[in-house]
């Protein structure tokens, strides 16, 4: 016979029969379930009807409370309880001691260096606004519309101009505080600065005075020009620019002292402001003499353009430069203003992109470098500032000179394009600690090859192997050249190759590494203690 029994929950106390001591009125308690909504603290319990089963279940009811307390107080159980308690605390103390030992003995995490914004990625030069945007459309308002493209390249700074008023070779008609109306107004510039800031793109203004003339510094009126530059620095810093560039400083008498003075103004305003100087010189001694008096100066030069495009010579140039500059932050480019294609054959562009993005320092590119823009392929276009090929409509002068794969639009749609490679490298460069500020170690890999490791503390490490030659080569990676902190593993994963056909992510045996002509490899491997 079924019955509902109401139990007041408040009355369930320890001195009554505990649930497990109550006879089970259903097989394994399965029939016990809630049989109604909660009502005034009461719970309805549905009891099974099968009394035969209930009787069978009631045969063993366990120890009573008195019996349980009696057994628990016996000497055997007391000793067992103490032993377990002691064991627990000993184990706990042992683990604590182990953790302390591990922490104490573990290698210290290397303190991160102070990172300025220009340390975190590439700079992108737009020396000719009209050529960059397409003829008839080159102004500051139009440039604002191209900031999303710059964001997609993950560049950290835009080196703009010069855009100031400059009547060729006329100091009196050169005003570094005024924007040439052909490029827009001060309001347009302010608006560009605001938009760039929102996209985390810094703006560096080129103040090379006589940019339309024969001598960039007017040669005979150096002091007048220097004063103009000083005034301009203060004016544009107040306007919110993030830095300045001055080019052709080999034409500036007493360049070192002027640069030091301008650097003081720039850094005096904020340590977060940058001064870039450009020179056509490729002579290391001249470059070093400019750097010596200016600790935070970023210098672009033609130093690397003399590499002769051989692995050994490039390795020698890079290592000499890094040794000579010590722990100074470097920049890497092939010139102060020109396109990579001015110096390199098409087949070496990918290799150089890989190298510039993975050397320690700031890579500096000119607009168009990311697509391999080549003035020689565009008849009539100036070598120093050809029209940017956004799409096939960008060069209507001679349409047949432009094919889809030469344009931003065409290359954006092709994962194997130079532009896609640029974007990937730029992304890696801006997020991997070993590439951001890691140590650099070049080592022998055989004739024609240039190889090096970038590593930072216990972060993922990168191995770069570059084949500058026009024949395939086997890399004999000489790990003996490397310090213990930068040892090579037996295998490394392929992050990317400059040539198609390799399976990315696959592990490559470093002893059996073969490179195609003009191929560059970027490999990654974990830190091993």
């Amino acid at each position: 016979m079924s019955q509902d029994t109401e139990v007041d929950m408040k009355e369930v106390e320890l001195n009554e029969l505990e649930p497990e001591k109550q006879p089970m009125n259903a097989a394994s308690g399965a029939a016990m379930s809630l049989a109604g909504a909660e009502k005034n603290g009461l719970v309805k319990i549905k009891v099974a009807e099968d009394e035969a089963e209930a009787a069978a279940a009631a045969k063993f009811t366990g120890l009573s409370k008195e019996e349980l307390l009696k057994v628990a107080g016996s000497p055997g159980w007391v000793r067992t309880r103490w032993a377990l308690l002691l064991l627990f605390w000993l184990g706990w103390l042992g683990m604590l001691a182990g953790a302390v030992v591990i922490i104490v003995r573990a290698p210290r995490c290397r303190e991160l260096p102070a990172q300025k914004w220009w340390h975190t990625g590439a700079l992108y030069r737009i020396g000719d606004l009209q050529a960059f945007q397409g003829h008839g459309a080159g102004n500051l308002a139009g440039l604002k519309g191209r900031l999303d493209y710059l964001s997609s390249l993950k560049v950290k700074g835009l080196v703009l101009g010069p855009i100031h008023k400059n009547q060729k070779d006329d100091v009196a008609q050169t005003d570094l505080l005024q924007i040439d109306p052909n490029f827009g107004s001060k309001e347009d510039f302010d608006s560009l600065l605001q938009s760039a800031k929102k996209k985390s793109i810094r703006v560096i203004l080129d103040l090379t005075p006589n940019y339309r003339g024969e001598n960039s510094w007017f040669s005979t009126q150096v002091d007048t020009v220097a004063t103009k530059v000083k005034d301009a620095l203060e004016f544009w810093l107040q306007a919110g620019v993030d830095g300045f560039q001055v080019r052709d400083i080999e034409n500036l008498k007493d360049a070192s002292s002027f640069l030091a003075e301008w650097q003081n103004i720039t850094k005096g305003f904020s340590e977060d402001r940058l001064l870039i100087a450009g020179t056509n010189s490729s002579d290391l001694q001249q470059i070093l003499s400019l750097l010596e008096s200016n600790k935070d100066l970023l210098l672009t030069s033609s130093y690397l353009s003399d590499s002769g495009s051989t692995g050994e010579h490039t390795k020698s140039l890079v290592t000499q430069y890094l040794n000579a500059t010590g722990n100074r932050w470097c920049s890497w480019s092939l010139s102060q203003a020109r396109l990579l294609t001015s110096f390199l054959p098409a087949q070496l562009l990918r290799l150089y992109q890989l190298m510039l993005f993975t050397l320690p320092g700031t890579p500096v590119f000119s607009y168009g470098d990311e697509i391999g823009l080549d003035a020689a392929a565009l008849p009539g276009q100036p070598m120093e500032a050809p029209v940017m090929l956004w799409d096939e409509s960008s060069f209507p002068d001679i349409p047949g000179a432009v094919s889809a794969n030469m344009t931003v639009k065409g290359q954006s749609e092709d994962p194997g394009s130079l532009l896609s490679l640029f974007r990937r490298l730029s992304d890696q460069r801006s997020k991997e600690r070993s590439l951001l500020h890691g140590d650099f170690h070049a080592f022998s890999a055989g004739p024609g090859l240039f190889s090096y490791i970038r590593h930072w503390d216990q972060n993922e490490r990168f191995l770069v192997v570059l084949n500058f030659g026009d024949v395939g080569l086997s890399a004999g990676l000489q790990a003996s050249d490397l310090p213990a902190s930068a040892s090579l593993p037996a295998k490394a994963d392929l992050l990317l190759s400059t040539q198609p056909g390799r399976e990315e992510g696959s592990p490559l045996e470093l002893e059996r590494l073969k490179l195609e002509p003009h191929e560059g490899l970027l490999l990654r491997f974990p830190y091993a203690a």
Epitope: G136, A375, G380, Q381, G400
Partner: antibody, heavy 122, light 113 residues
Amino acid sequence: QVQLKESGPGLVQPSQTLSLTCTVSGFSLSSYGVIWVRQPPGKGLEWMGIIWANGNTNYNSALKSRLSISRDTSKSQVYLKMNSLQTEDTATYYCARHYYDGTHYYGYFDYWGQGVMVTVSS
Amino acid sequence: DTVMTQTPSSQAVSAGEKVTMSCKSSQSLLYSENKKKYLAWYQQKPGQSPKLLIYWASTRESGVPDRFIGSGSGTDFTLTISSVQAEDLAVYYCQQYYNFPYTFGAGTKLELK
């Protein structure tokens, strides 16, 4: 008004170098490109090369190894130099102005010089 | 290079007659972005230098009589002289400027019957 005028020797010895001058007026060489075209007797027109407004040059690939075009903007003159002349280089040589609309350089030629006849013979 | 083929190589005509000459290019000279055809026609009278007649395949240069009519598609172009005058006797050249290097046709010579 726009004018172009070629000048140079009428007779050149084989294997010697041809030097021609194109003197322009009515426009600036800093704004317009100038081309050289030649025409062997009784034959068609052959484009030889161009010097652009910015000073860049391009040449007909068949002539590239022995042709050089330069200019002096202050004198408004364009120069053609071609070495290792052979009898088949006998032709009338013309200079012409490359069209420019202020923005684009479209490749047709709106003004021509009167031409200079050059004979290559010993 | 883009090859320009002109036909006929010569043509005998009478004054007042309508005449057409053809120029074919080895690749299209129509640029889809601006819908323009990159073809020019020149006239070279005996003993004179060439003179620009037509550009963009159909636009007459200023001062050129309207009896000269240029037409054509992307690869096939025609120069028509609606009523030939004695002063029109000359060699006519077509030239493409869509590709570089620029190339000329071999010419069509217009003679009197």
